[in-house]
C-alpha cells in the first residue's frame, strides 16, 4: 500500500457541503476550514477522514499497488481497503509490500496453516509441534505439498 499522504484543500469547491463544527470538531467525512468556522466535506474517491477532527485537510485515499486487489473503495469516511493477491501475503513488520508465500515446508516439518493475504504458510516440527521461525529454506530442503495435504 502506498503511504497515505494528505490532501490540502485551500478552498472548498462549490459542490462541497459545509456545516458548522461541533465542539470545535468536524464529523467524519469532513475537515475544518482555515478560519475554523466551517466543516468542509472530503471529496469522494479522493480523500477521507474517519473520525471527528479539526484537521485542515482530509487524508488522501490510498491507491492499491500492483499485486494487490481492492476489497472496498475509498469513501469520504473510510480509506481504500487493499489486500494481497492470492499466493502472496503482507507481513506485520514489512507492510509496504506483498511477499510470495512459501510453496512448502522444510524437511521434518509439516504444514498446519495455509497461505492467506496476511500470513505465510505455517510450518511446525513433526515431533515437537513447535513453529518454524519463518526463514525461507534452501530449495533442496523444501518439501512441497498440494494445498491441504500435509508434507510427509
Amino acid at each position: 500500500i502506498t503511504q497515505q499522504d494528505l490532501a490540502p484543500q485551500q478552498r472548498a469547491a462549490p459542490q462541497q457541503k459545509r456545516s458548522s463544527p461541533s465542539e470545535g470538531l468536524c464529523p467524519p467525512g469532513h475537515h475544518i476550514s482555515e478560519d475554523g468556522r466551517d466543516c468542509i466535506s472530503c471529496k469522494y474517491g479522493q480523500d477521507y477522514s474517519t473520525h471527528w477532527n479539526d484537521l485542515l485537510f482530509c487524508l488522501r485515499c490510498t491507491r492499491c499497488d500492483s499485486g494487490e486487489v481492492e476489497l472496498s473503495p475509498c469513501t469520504t469516511t473510510r480509506n481504500t481497503v487493499c489486500q494481497c493477491e492470492e499466493g502472496t501475503f503482507r507481513e506485520e513488520d514489512s507492510p509496504e509490500m506483498c511477499r510470495k508465500c512459501r510453496t512448502g515446508c522444510p524437511r521434518g516439518m509439516v504444514k498446519v496453516g495455509d497461505c492467506t493475504p496476511w500470513s505465510d504458510i505455517e510450518c511446525v516440527h513433526k515431533e515437537s509441534g513447535t513453529k518454524h521461525s519463518g526463514e525461507v529454506p534452501a530449495v533442496e530442503e523444501t518439501v512441497t505439498s498440494s494445498p491441504g495435504t500435509p508434507a510427509s
Epitope: L6, G24, L25, I32, S33, G36, R37, N53, D54
Partner: antibody, heavy 117, light 110 residues
Amino acid sequence: EVQLVETGGGLIQPGGSLRLSCAASGFTVSRYAMIWVRQAPGKGLEYIGFITSDGSTYYADSAKGRFTISRDNSKNTLYLQMNSLRAEDTAVYYCARYTYSDGTDLWGRGTLVTVSS
Amino acid sequence: DIQMTQSPSTLSASVGDRVTITCRASQSISTYLSWYQQKPGKAPKRLIYKASSLASGVPSRFSGSGSGTEFTLTISSLQPDDAATYYCQPNSGIATYGAAFGGGTKVEIK
C-alpha cells in the same frame, strides 16, 4: 493596540492551586481559539491546551486532569486554572491567539509561576 | 499525537552565513507549519506560517519551505539580531493531535 497580558503568576507551594488570567485588548477572545503554552527555565516551549471559539477545550496529556482553561467573554479574558501544582510546573506561562491555518499569531509576555516549598 | 523533531539543536554561524534549520513531523501535516523566534526573556514571535508565508514585519532574509513531513527554515544572510532560539509547530489538528512544538534550535553568532 492588539495585545495579551498574563497575570496571576508567583510563588506557590507544591500541592497548591493558582489561576492565571490573560486579558485581551484590541480583539474579541470569543471569536478566536486561544492557546496556553509554558516554558520551564532553560527548556523549550510546551503546549498545554486550547479553547475554541465555541468554548470547547482540549489539553495536552500532561495537562489533563489538573489544568482547566476557561474564558469570561464579558471581561474579554482567558483563564488557566492549575491544581495540585508540582515543582516541575515551574515555568513561564504564555497565553496566545491561535488561528487554525496561520498558527499562533499573537503572544502575551508571559507570567512566571514558581512551585517551591 | 504528532511529534516534531528539530535539527540541529544548536548551531553557531558567522554574520552573513546562510543558515538552515530542519523540522520533521511524525505524520504529514501538508503545509500547515509555523516557525517562531524567541529571544531570552521574551515571548516567541511568529516568523513563518503555512510553511512558507512570511509573517508581517519579518525581514525577507527569513524563508520557509517544505510540505508533508519535512520542513526547512532558512536565514539567507545571518545578522547579529538573529541570535535566538527557533521553534516549529504544526497548525492542523490541534484538538485531534495536539500542538507539540519542536525541541528548538539555538542559533549563536560566532
